[in-house]
Amino acid sequence: QLPPGKPEIFKCRSPNKETFTCWWRPGTDGGLPTNYSLTYHREGETLMHECPDYITGGPNSCHFGKQYTSMWRTYVMMVNATNQMGSSFSDELYVDVTYIVQPDPPLELTVEVKQPEDRKPYLWMKWSPPTLIDLKTGWFTLLYEIRLKPEKAAEWETHFAGQQTEFKILSLHPGQKYLVQVRCKPDHGYWSAWSPATFIQIPSDFIMNDHHHHHH
């Protein structure tokens, strides 16, 4: 029987900069029941606080609700593992909420086949940013990525759309039914999950274009 091994806080995420959750990995348990506590202070403070909510994020997590979350202050946190034989501490972790945002997927993905008379046909898609993300403040830049594939295909084709919320794709297989999805990430955050798939039937008379795709 031994003291617990060193835990590691390995992940912190915020859906919208207003709340966030951090997760830790326990070290070895030393063969004894082990208690974990997360303590933190914010930059400019010396007073240590204990995690306000060990429940919401699931096992080995600490959730910071709205009243505990500040975008303006860096959080300095540490996990303590204790059993009957002793204690061990994780390394200190520094968290700036700006850099841990993982948004919800984009919304309202619509996909249409456009067949202008004077030009080659193309697939046109548009979407909206997730509702929880406030883009009006200016500091939040969302980047988007699209993926699509014929229904029966194994491989996805991905396209980076930058900050645009619409996109054209010119090269598709006529007569195929395609699945299309979009996801987003802040410049220094994390990719959202993919949006639910939207299906689009490409007409049999769709003319393949030499140019693969272009941004709108």
């Epitope: 590691e8 390995f10 992940k11 912190c12 990995r25 930059e43 400019g44 975008m71 303006w72 860096t74 390394d91 972790l93 520094y94 968290v95 700036d96 700006t98 850099y99 841990i100 403040t137 200016g138 500091w139 990430k185 220094h188 994390y190 990719w191």
Partner: antibody, heavy 118, light 112 residues
Framework: EVQLVQSGAEVKKPGSSVKVSCKAS????????IHWVRQAPGQGLEWIGE????????NYNQKFKGRATLTVDKSSSTAYMELSSLRSEDTAVYYC???????????WGQGTLVTVSS | DVVMTQTPLSLSVTPGQPASISCRSS???????????LHWYLQKPGQSPQLLIY???NRFSGVPDRFSGSGSGTDFTLKISRVEAEDVGVYYC?????????FGGGTKVEIK
């Protein structure tokens, strides 16, 4: 203990490429961005770019875009910086550095001297 | 790119005496999220840089309290209240508000 261990010194000819490695240990490699910074002899520090090892997303200093390529190998917890079309002005010590969930550099590698000479 | 200008270029200090380094940026370092990402690093002779101060005034873990940072907007200062022999090296200010991140030219601190 967090460690960033870089590959050894390199001597390269002008016009060639160099690939510097940075092996991370003591933490979950995919959790934090890796940055690359260089320092020419007797000079200050210059930021080359950054990579998120979780998805290989990169941001580059425009000065190096097209010449520097940042990559990672998650299986070996190693980050790489490749610089092509080398010229004598690229002679420098190249550092990898790691952030937390922040945008400043908490841990640094020991540096790799790259000498470009004909 | 944001230009970071440090003064003085070098500083010779008697042990136990204070030292002050100034850093000025060519544009405001206040991020649109309200934070100011101005940091100070020390590069001791023959070593890699090490973080001293993050976000203007916050000492990094293990940094002695004789180091302090202050300033706002475009003007920032690093102060050492009582210089010790182990403080010799080159001090760099750095901003990470704007991409590309940039560094000052450095201030060399030596002991008299």
């Amino acid at each position: 203990e967090v460690q960033l261990v870089q590959s050894g010194a390199e001597v390269k000819k002008p016009g060639s490429s160099v690939k510097v490695s940075c092996k991370a240990s003591g933490y979950t490699f995919t959790s934090y961005w890796i940055h690359w910074v260089r320092q020419a002899p007797g000079q200050g520090l210059e930021w080359i770019g950054e990579i998120d090892p979780s998805d290989s997303y990169t941001n580059y200093n425009q000065k190096f875009k097209g010449r520097a390529t940042l990559t990672v190998d998650k299986s070996s917890s190693t980050a790489y910086m490749e610089l092509s079309s080398l010229r004598s002005e690229d002679t420098a010590v190249y550092y990898c550095a790691r952030s937390f969930f922040t945008n400043w550099f908490a841990y640094w590698g020991q540096g790799t001297l790259v000498t470009v000479s004909s | 790119d944001v230009v970071m200008t440090q003064t003085p270029l070098s500083l010779s200090v008697t042990p136990g005496q204070p030292a002050s380094i100034s850093c000025r940026s060519s544009q405001s370092l206040v991020h649109s999220n309200g934070n100011t990402y101005l940091h100070w690093y020390l590069q001791k002779p023959g070593q890699s840089p090490q973080l001293l101060i993050y976000k203007v005034s916050n000492r990094f873990s293990g940094v002695p309290d004789r180091f302090s940072g202050s300033g706002s907007g475009t003007d920032f200062t690093l102060k050492i209240s009582r210089v010790e022999a182990e403080d010799v090296g080159v001090y760099y200010c750095s901003q990470s508000t704007h991409v590309p991140f940039t560094f000052g030219g450095g201030t060399k601190v030596e002991i008299k």
